[in-house]
């Protein structure tokens, strides 16, 4: 049940990331730690790196409000179940600073990719023999 709530939140975050991708030119072109090819059991640690990153609106044009609302939603902490398990893995997972830094466009693409991986793992874990390659 708790894991389901997490994954439902991940699915909603994909939509928010996709929305922000439409406004990449209105984001501060700062390089941010962007985990990629995250090792098994370090997904939650990588997720928290994405959430901690200082993604910012460039404060130009009419899109500032919608961008700031979306960034706020991205940073909202998921429900606290499984927090202990996440803490345990954080000890052995790479630190946020050790990940390659990327501009906002690639940062958002990698964030989306991690969210997709987590949802897919969750869906596959409920099903026997669904994964073919």
């Amino acid at each position: 049940q708790g894991q389901d709530r997490h994954m439902i939140r991940m699915r909603q975050l994909i939509d928010i990331v996709d929305q922000l991708k439409n406004y990449v030119n209105d984001l501060v072109p700062e390089f941010l730690p962007a985990p990629e090819d995250v090792e098994t059991n370090c997904e939650w640690s990588a997720f928290s790196c994405f959430q901690k990153a200082q993604l910012k609106s460039a404060n130009t044009g009419n899109n500032e409000r919608i961008i700031n609302v979306s960034i706020k939603k991205l940073k909202r902490k998921p429900p606290s179940t499984n927090a202990g398990r996440r803490q345990k893995h954080r000890l052995t997972c790479p630190s946020c600073d050790s990940y390659e830094k990327k501009p906002p466009k690639e940062f958002l693409e990698r964030f989306k990719s991690l969210l997709q991986k987590m949802i897919h793992q969750h869906l596959s874990s409920r099903t026997h023999g669904s994964e073919d390659s």
Partner: antibody, heavy 117, light 107 residues
């Protein structure tokens, strides 16, 4: 706006292999999941399977032995092969994108494939 | 496989009517349910994902609710462009499965 377009033969003979291609425009195939869904005449929708941009696949167990989905990132296309077809495989075949893994946010208009000798 | 049962199979309604379509899963699927609108010869359109989240660009007259086994799609005030067939789809486990569809027709 992502657009998808199915292409391939509209008529396939029984026991042969059905081959369809989906061309993606307005977005890159090198992220997201890309799937196939079909609808036999007068029936509901049936998920065939999907492939991730990294190449991992999930297939409907009812079709698994006969299905192959592959992706060609250089052409921004993905394809479906269904072997040993019978009249029961006659359907409108749709390709679709799944950004959220669990649902399909962009679809092609569908292409009718008839299996008949 | 998880079976998805939609009711009614068809409904006649007028512009401005409130229309409710239900979808029942053969086992609990949490909130892993999507709703689609499909018009003949057109590409199906995602309306709702994870039971109640409105897909970007979809009018707010569409709403979804439910969790577990029973789900509802509501069109608060039917518009001329809403006459179509609606499908639910579960994503709790593979294989992904769809309901049989509900055709919304003009009264």
């Amino acid at each position: 706006q992502v657009q998808l377009q199915e292409s391939g033969p509209g008529l396939v003979k029984p026991s042969e292999t059905l081959s369809l291609t989906c061309t993606v425009s307005g977005g890159s195939i090198s992220s997201d999941f890309w799937g196939w869904i079909r609808q036999p005449p007068g029936k509901g929708l049936e998920w065939i399977g999907y492939i991730s941009s990294s190449g991992s696949t999930n297939y409907n167990p009812s079709l698994k032995r006969r299905v192959t989905i592959s992706v060609d990132t250089s052409r921004n296309q993905f394809s479906l092969k269904l072997s040993s077809v019978t009249a029961a495989d006659t359907a409108v075949y749709y390709c679709a994108r799944s950004a959220g893994v669990t649902d399909f946010d962009f679809w092609g208009q569908g292409t009718l494939v008839t299996v008949s000798s | 496989d998880i079976q998805m049962t939609q009711s009614p199979s068809s409904v006649s309604a007028s512009v401005g009517d409130r229309v409710t379509i239900t979808c029942r899963a053969s086992q609990g699927i949490s909130s892993w349910l999507a709703w689609y609108q499909h018009k003949p010869g057109k590409a199906p359109k995602l309306l709702i994902y994870v039971a109640s989240s409105l897909q970007s660009g979809v009018p707010s007259r569409f709403s979804g609710s439910g969790s577990g086994t029973d789900f509802t799609l509501t069109i608060s005030s039917l518009q001329p462009e809403d006459f179509a067939t609606y499908y639910c789809q579960q994503a709790n486990s593979f294989p992904l499965t769809f309901g049989g569809g509900t055709k919304v027709e003009i009264k």
